[in-house]
Interface confidence: medium
């Protein structure tokens, strides 16, 4: 219960704080747990006890290991234990999962993601920002204090947010960098009766003979990641693939989120050399969800080639 | 009549990895497949789910990255494979589809397979 578990990067400040809380008038005794042996006080040390605070500066990965801290008052004493681990900077930018402090939501109304751990540090702003290992740059992201403000979240702001700043201790620096996960959750996700925004209602698509033609279904579906929704084609009634006509194929496009939020999905039909009797067919674009099912028909007709030299 | 069987839950301990399958029977055509759950006293919730048309998958952000959703046209099969399991994920695991059945579009759901995740 009174362990606390602490990490951190060789040659970085790193500053673990005794889990058991006293009044700041009681004296606190660090150890270091395999040993017994006492940690120094004095300042000169790279790894010396301040209070309530066992500071590393830097931290080595031989560090590493269970300190003890013993809060110690006129009528008790309380034992507490900082389980220390000091890793190797990796090489690449992935951050492993042991590295990570606790993830953090974020949605359109609140987006503060704050650095982990940064209050028992001496750091003066601006603090820096990654996102992926990536500087974050743009008027949408503002480091404010101790956190990151993300204007606008969208779901593509989602990933592992890296701060770091800079630690002073008697004129010295130290690096310190730390980083959590965020997700975004949709606050206003809703999902709804499909709404066909393409083609129109009983709409006259103009093609071709002997040309290829590309026919669009589009539909929305609701504002947020839309689960089960469908977008497709019918050839008189009759689904494609069993149409049996091999010229007349439909293929998954692009998805799309619309900057009102939509979450859309569109099928494209493709015909390859117009023939006359594919005027003669009805062509239905279908969206379905768990609401149900929205039909817009559309019918082809005949494009008289235009004569440029009339 | 549309069937849709689901398999792969048991209890698995925390960090560990089950896949769910689900199968749809007396369809002629799935259009597009997904895992919901549902823990004790929850909302149901959306896992992930994937078109058959394009294979686009969807996921729930608390799964992504450790669950991946896939599926056999052939078969008319969804796999959900879960990885990284954590206790929160402990649910019912419901399958669902829009599929045509018989000239009729529809969507349906299976009786579910409950996944425990525990030490």
């Known amino acids: 219960k009174f362990s606390k578990q602490s990490w951190g990067l060789e040659n970085e400040a790193l500053i673990v704080r005794c889990p058991r809380q006293g009044k700041p008038s009681y004296t606190v005794d660090w150890y270091y747990s395999q040993t017994n042996k006492s940690i120094p006080t004095q300042e000169r040390n790279r790894v010396f006890a301040s209070g309530q605070l066992l500071k590393f500066l830097p931290a080595a990965v031989a560090d590493s290991g269970i300190y003890t801290c013993i809060v110690r008052s006129p009528t008790f004493n309380r034992t507490g234990y900082a389980n220390v681990t000091i890793y190797k900077k990796q090489s690449d930018c992935n951050v492993p999962d042991y590295l990570m402090y606790s993830t953090v939501s974020g949605s359109e109304k609140n987006s503060k993601i704050y650095c982990p751990t940064i209050d028992l540090y001496n750091w003066t702003a601006p603090l820096e920002w990654f996102k992926n290992c990536q500087a974050l740059q743009g008027s949408r992201y503002r480091a404010h204090k101790s956190f990151l403000v993300i204007d606008n979240v969208m779901t593509e702001d989602a990933g592992d947010y890296t701060c770091k700043f800079i630690h002073n201790e008697n004129g010295a620096n130290y690096s310190v960098t730390a980083t959590r996960s965020f997700t975004v959750k949709d606050e206003q996700g809703f999902s709804l009766f499909p709404v066909i925004g393409a083609p129109a209602q009983n709409e006259i698509k103009e093609v071709e003979i002997g040309k290829n033609a590309n026919l669009t279904c589009s539909a929305c579906f609701g504002k947020g990641t839309q689960f089960l929704a469908a977008v497709l084609w019918q050839l008189n009634g009759t689904k494609i693939t069993d149409f049996g006509e091999p010229r007349i194929q439909q293929e998954e496009g692009q998805n799309q989120s619309f900057s009102n939020g939509l979450a859309c999905l569109d099928m494209v039909l493709r015909i390859a050399d117009v023939k006359e009797e594919d005027l003669l067919l009805q062509y239905d674009c279908l969206a379905l969800n768990l609401h149900g099912l929205r039909r817009h028909t559309v019918r082809l007709s005949r494009k008289n080639p235009i004569d440029h030299h009339s | 009549e549309v069937q849709l069987v689901e398999s792969g839950g048991g209890l698995v301990q925390p960090g560990g990895s089950l896949r769910l399958s689900c199968a749809a029977s007396g369809l002629t055509t799935v259009y597009t497949m997904g895992w919901f759950r549902q823990a004790p006293g929850k909302e149901r919730e959306s896992v992930a789910s994937?078109?058959?048309?394009?294979?686009?998958?969807y996921y729930a952000d608390s799964v992504k990255g450790r669950f991946t959703i896939s599926a056999d046209n052939s078969k008319n099969t969804a796999y959900l494979q879960m990885n990284s399991l954590k206790p929160e994920d402990t649910a019912v695991y419901y399958c669902?589809?829009?599929?045509?059945?018989?000239?009729?579009?529809?969507?349906?759901w299976g009786q579910g397979t409950l996944v425990t995740v525990s030490s």
């Open positions: 994937i078109s058959w048309t394009g294979g686009t998958t």
């Open positions: 669902a589809a829009i599929a045509h059945e018989e000239g009729v579009y529809r969507w349906d």
